[in-house]
């Protein structure tokens, strides 16, 4: 196509010097349109009478000759006014001017749609000199021809801070019908109407629309561009297109696939990505979604314990990220798991069953019966208690953990003891005289630490002191109690 | 006085690690465990784990993967990380004492913000 | 694990006037290991009622906390200005250990 600037062209000098070969008195007559050889462009001619002058733009030169006689008003000749030629053909047109020599610098410049073009390429301007005035034609040629030359070309001469401009020469570039809007591909419901765009331009106008289905004319008679198609419905999938004729020929948009949105399929590899005692996380692969976006997925679990009662529970997640922690679950326990996704059209099949298992939960209930007393001749603190009625899932007791705090006017700590299953004892030394030792119990399987007894508080007297007894857990509503005999 | 002071990066990448230090002042860490609890605006206060006295770690089961506490009592600091961070990892971080009487989380930290972005 | 759920979760008062908010566990929580604590914006939580019913250093008197098993509340006597905060309760019982969502208190 044709670079477009607004930038002024450097002036061609109107006397450049002795041309190239010798000057000829039987030149080129004035209008007419030099080619290259061998070429003959389909040019049609505006009707108006060549070698007249024309009345558009025109500049009246104040300057006198010698003999004082006024100069004649200055305008380009007219020329060819409409060309109507084939994409990719070569074009060449040209604007003359007859200018009296005694203008120096004289610039001629080609626009187009009111932008000035540049490309010296394109542009040639020729020179005649003669005994009073210069012959000057400024031809422009296209080699390949594109939609885009497509308008109205002048030439300006700017001659004593006059400007001249020529009649314009429209190029009309015609071709194949040119689509400005195909149709798009969609997913659609079942049976319910929707509407397809095509539009395409020439030149030549009119252009004329037929619409395909499945390789099968729609419309008998041609609708003129632009045209809808609507189409009542469908049961399966289609693929339509559009053929758009002018009088250059045919040419067809792309094909474009209608879907029918359905179901989605099921997801598949649902996978255990981490198991705790009371959680399991989840994630799946959906399956294809229907042609219609995903909205919402389901995780359905059931006890896979054959003496459980069958329920079901339903969990509700976005569709994204294809990742679910299942929450609220028993330790220790065997679950069946699938997945089910929607869209707008309805659910998809549960995906197939995989098996999961939580792991060890830590002990639900804390040790009973805490029982704390000072055995002054060993200087220890005994502590016992009974086990804790734990439940299967809670899994097997490994031992228990156990916290001394030990307060006295000057030091405050808490050290944590870990003693082994086997019995429902355990015996501490004293750490601190004069002081309330404060313990608790909780029971520990490999599921992690269950919760702490409530606190018993017991006083270290300073030594010498003979009786001890016992602290012991509360009876409820009873806090704190420190026993001291 | 009791004191904690919390040190931490304000901004981690993405799947990166992230490392707070926690000192404390006005009583020892061989006397006291210390627990750290993050806070966020979608999952409220939620608890992370704890070091006790004697070294001793409990965590909460949904970061025992990815959490790692330690100590060193003799500089009085506590080092908590916590690595494959996530957009929705974005909180305030606290560590906090816990107490003997009342048996609670008895002074806190003043948290570090931290924001999970690239 | 154990779930706490305070409500209301918003609530204003007048000057003066009585408050009281609720924690309810899903399992039953020893009283012993049940806690209140205080957080004004910008600020850390700060321990307020520990063990269900006693406060803590420097809380005011106007301030009471009661319940057992699976109920717990928070009383304040007389709505004062200083008092407008988020209070959350706290098991620290059963790991995980679980805070509440909180009740955000303001004045009318």
């Known amino acids: 196509a044709i670079t477009e600037a607004r930038e002024e062209a450097k002036p061609y000098p109107l006397f450049p010097g002795p041309f190239p070969g010798s000057l000829q008195t039987d030149h080129t007559p004035l209008l007419s349109l030099p080619h290259a050889s061998g070429y003959q462009p389909a040019l049609m001619f505006s009707p108006t009478q060549p070698g007249r002058p024309h009345t558009g733009n025109v500049a009246i030169p104040q300057v006198t000759s010698v003999e004082s006689k006024p100069l004649p008003p200055l305008a380009f000749k007219h020329t060819v006014g409409h060309i109507i030629l084939s994409e990719h053909k070569g074009v060449k047109f040209n604007c003359s001017i007859s200018v009296p020599n005694i203008y120096q610098d004289t610039t001629i410049s080609w626009w187009k749609d009111g932008k000035e073009l540049l490309g010296a390429h394109h542009a040639i301007t020729q020179f005649y000199p003669d005994d009073e005035v210069t012959a000057i034609i400024a031809s422009f040629s296209i080699t390949s021809v594109q939609r885009s030359d497509n308008g109205s070309y002048i030439c300006k001469m700017k001659i004593n801070n006059e400007e001249i401009v020529s009649d314009p020469i429209y190029i009309e570039v015609q071709g194949l019908p040119h689509f400005t809007k195909q149709p798009e591909s969609m997913n659609v419901t079942r049976n319910t109407a929707f509407n397809l765009t095509c539009q395409a331009v020439g030149p030549p106008e009119p252009v004329n629309i037929f619409w395909v289905q499945n390789s099968s004319r729609v419309n008998e008679q041609p609708e003129k561009s632009p045209s809808v198609l609507t189409v009542p419905g469908l049961t399966e999938m289609a693929v339509f297109s559009c053929e758009a004729h002018n009088d250059k020929g045919l040419t067809v948009s792309k094909g474009v696939q209608i879907n029918i949105k359905a179901i989605p399929s099921p997801p598949t590899e649902v996978s255990i990505r981490n198991s705790t005692a009371h959680s399991i996380l989840i994630s799946w692969v959906p399956g294809f979604d229907g042609y219609s976006p995903f909205r919402n997925c389901s995780i359905q679990v059931k006890e896979a314990d054959p003496l459980s009662n069958g329920s079901v529970m339903i969990f509700n997640t976005s569709a994204l990220p294809h990742l679910y922690q299942i929450k609220q679950l028993q330790a220790l326990a065997n679950y069946s798991i699938g997945v089910s996704c929607m869209n707008e059209i309805g659910w998809s099949a549960v995906s197939p069953w995989i098996l999961a298992s939580t792991t060890e939960g830590a002990p639900s209930v804390a040790p009973l019966n805490v029982t704390v007393f000072l055995n002054e001749s060993s200087d220890n603190v005994d502590i016992r208690w009974m086990k804790p009625p734990t439940k299967q899932q809670d899994g097997e007791l490994v031992g228990y953990r156990i916290s001394h705090v030990w307060q006295s006017a000057g030091i405050s700590k808490e050290l944590l003891e870990e003693v082994g299953q086997n019995g429902s004892r355990a015996r501490i030394s004293v750490q601190v005289h004069n002081a309330t030792c404060t313990v608790r119990i909780a029971a520990v399987t490999r599921g992690g630490v269950g919760p702490f007894s409530d606190p018993v508080k017991i006083f270290i007297p300073a030594h010498g002191w003979v009786d001890y007894a016992p602290s012991s857990t509360p009876a409820p509503g009873n806090a704190d109690p420190v026993l001291i005999i | 006085q009791v004191q904690l002071r919390q040190s931490g990066p304000g901004l981690v990448q993405p799947s990166q690690s992230l490392s707070i230090t926690c000192t404390v002042s006005?009583?020892?860490?061989?006397?006291?465990?210390l627990h750290w609890v993050r806070q966020s605006p979608g999952k409220g206060l939620e608890w992370l784990g704890v070091?006790?006295?004697?070294?001793?770690?409990d965590y909460n089961a949904a970061f025992i993967s990815r959490l790692s506490i330690i100590k060193d009592n003799s500089r009085s600091q506590v080092f908590f990380k916590m690595n494959s961070l996530q957009a929705d990892d974005t909180a305030i971080y606290y560590c906090?004492?816990?107490?003997?009487?009342?048996?609670?989380?008895?002074?806190w930290g003043q948290g570090t913000s931290v924001t999970v972005s690239s | 694990q154990i779930v706490l759920t305070q409500s209301p979760p918003i609530m204003s008062a007048f000057l003066g006037e009585r408050v009281t908010m609720t924690c309810t566990a899903s399992s039953s929580v020893s009283s012993s290991y049940l806690h209140w604590y205080r957080q004004m914006p910008g600020s850390s939580p700060k321990l307020w009622i520990y063990d269900t019913s006693n406060l803590a250093s420097g809380v005011p008197a106007r301030f009471s906390g009661s319940g057992s098993g699976t109920s717990y509340s928070l009383t304040i006597s007389s709505m004062e200005a200083e008092d407008a905060a988020t209070y959350y309760c706290h098991q620290y019982h059963h790991s995980p250990y679980t805070f509440g969502g909180g009740t955000k208190l303001e004045i009318k």
């Open positions: 906090a004492r816990k107490g003997h009487d009342p048996y609670a989380m008895d002074f």
């Open positions: 006005g009583f020892s860490l061989s006397n006291y465990g």
């Open positions: 070091i006790w006295s004697g070294g001793i770690t």
